[in-house]
């Protein structure tokens, strides 16, 4: 049995898969910040995790996915306010009893040192210095991401 948050995450992922593929994003849109091969957008309001997830999708983006410790540190370096927490795209899957990214992959236990419990209705937030497990209903800010995907020239065989 999936929780409402897991259902919401799956629905958004499926609808994203159904949409026609867009050309690659070469530069970050206005208001977005570039971090390596990603564009990040920091919210200026607060929401529970599932509303944050949905709001990123309205920007044709997703909640932030963090590949490794190095990317976490670089992202945290962009956070200017000490005490502010931001949702990222990671929540606890009750059915699999594990932290699960919204793209369906599981957290590599070495990637993030999470403060707090791994339990039902827990979602992950980051601050300038730490990574926290919070109740998904907590209302905090969030970070959306778009991948920068340089367009490669297609080579067509002679007709």
């Amino acid at each position: 049995q999936k929780s409402s948050i897991e259902k919401c995450s799956v629905d958004i992922q499926q609808s994203r898969n159904k949409t026609t593929e867009r050309p690659g994003l070469l530069n970050c849109p206005i208001y977005w910040q570039q971090l390596r091969e990603k564009c990040l957008l920091f919210s200026h309001t607060v929401n529970p995790w599932n509303n944050s997830l949905a709001d990123c999708s309205t920007k044709e983006s997703s909640l932030l996915l963090i590949r490794d410790k190095d990317e976490l540190i670089h992202t945290q370096n962009l956070i200017r306010d000490k005490a502010i927490l931001f949702w990222i795209g990671l929540n606890f899957s009750l059915s699999e009893k594990n932290w699960k990214w919204i793209n369906g992959s599981f957290l590599n236990s070495n990637d993030l040192e999470i403060r707090g419990d791994a339990k039902e209705n827990s979602c992950i937030s980051i601050s300038q210095t730490s990574v926290y497990s919070e109740y998904c209903s907590t209302e905090i800010r969030w970070i959306c991401q778009k991948e920068l995907t340089p367009v490669r020239n297609k080579v067509y065989p002679d007709s």
Epitope: I30, Y31, L41, F42, S43, H44, T45, V46, N47, P48, N51, D55, K59, R80, D81, I84, E139, R141, C144
Partner: antibody
Framework: EVQLQQSGPELVKPGASMKISCKAS????????MNWVKQSHGKNLEWIGL????????YYNQKFKDKATLTVDKSSSTAYMELLSLTSEDSAVYYC?????????????WGQGTTLTVSS | DIVMTQSHKFMSTSVGDRVNITCKAS??????VVWYQQTPGQSPKVLID???IRHTGVPDRFTGSGSGTDFTLTISSVQSEDLADYFC?????????FGGGTKLEIK
């Protein structure tokens, strides 16, 4: 047409509390975050805090955390700010102001302001 | 807290003149700066967002520029209705802060 209609001027005694209202019309009330701003001496502007009308989530400027309480009534599309334990320092014009975008901190529509005078 | 300083509290100009209103941030705020106009007895009205993007319906005589710590609002040809206070605001941090305002007076 977007409008934010605030309650009228108030004269209150030191130590009292009071609540200012801000009735929104012309847009989806739950779709935009509401902010409150204090203007002292006709000039100095200070951001007090925000409330997400859809969820009731709030975030305050630490300076006003014990001074202001933000709430909303979705059924009447009205935001409220209660000011507590008033002193002469709280005499000012208070504005509600709509956040223009979830991802940028600017205010695209403002109420007409509510003048608060704290005096014995 | 980031302090936004508008060094000119008053500026006097004539109709048709070009005027530059400046604002200095105490630390780098990128382009997360807004300019507001407050005419006498009215509430503030947004003119410019993201340092240089004119808000919908704002006359093109208003132009914003700058990044980092130094920002300018330019009125290319002042009109009598531009008599107002002008405020800058930063949102680079979540504690939004405003400049002290510049009152534009028409000679």
């Amino acid at each position: 047409e977007v409008q934010l209609q605030q309650s009228g001027p108030e004269l209150v005694k030191p130590g009292a509390s009071m609540k200012i209202s801000c009735k929104a019309s012309g847009y989806s009330f739950t779709g935009y975050t509401m902010n409150w701003v204090k203007q002292s001496h006709g000039k100095n502007l200070e951001w007090i805090g925000l409330i997400n009308p859809n969820t009731g989530g709030t975030y305050y400027n630490q300076k006003f955390k014990d001074k202001a309480t933000l709430t909303v009534d979705k059924s009447s599309s009205t935001a409220y700010m209660e000011l507590l334990s008033l002193t002469s320092e709280d005499s000012a014009v208070y504005y509600c102001a709509r956040l223009g975008d979830n991802y940028r901190g600017y205010f695209d529509f403002w109420g007409q302001g509510t003048t608060l005078t704290v005096s014995s | 807290d980031i302090v936004m300083t508008q060094s000119h509290k008053f500026m006097s100009t004539s109709v048709g003149d070009r005027v530059n209103i400046t604002c200095k941030a105490s630390q780098d705020v990128g382009t997360a700066v807004v300019w507001y106009q407050q005419t006498p007895g009215q509430s503030p009205k947004v003119l410019i967002d993201w340092a240089s993007i004119r808000h919908t319906g704002v006359p093109d005589r208003f132009t914003g520029s700058g990044s980092g710590t130094d920002f300018t609002l330019t009125i290319s040809s002042v009109q009598s209705e531009d008599l107002a206070d002008y405020f800058c605001q930063q949102y680079s941090t979540y504690l939004y802060t405003f400049g002290g305002g510049t009152k534009l007076e028409i000679k």
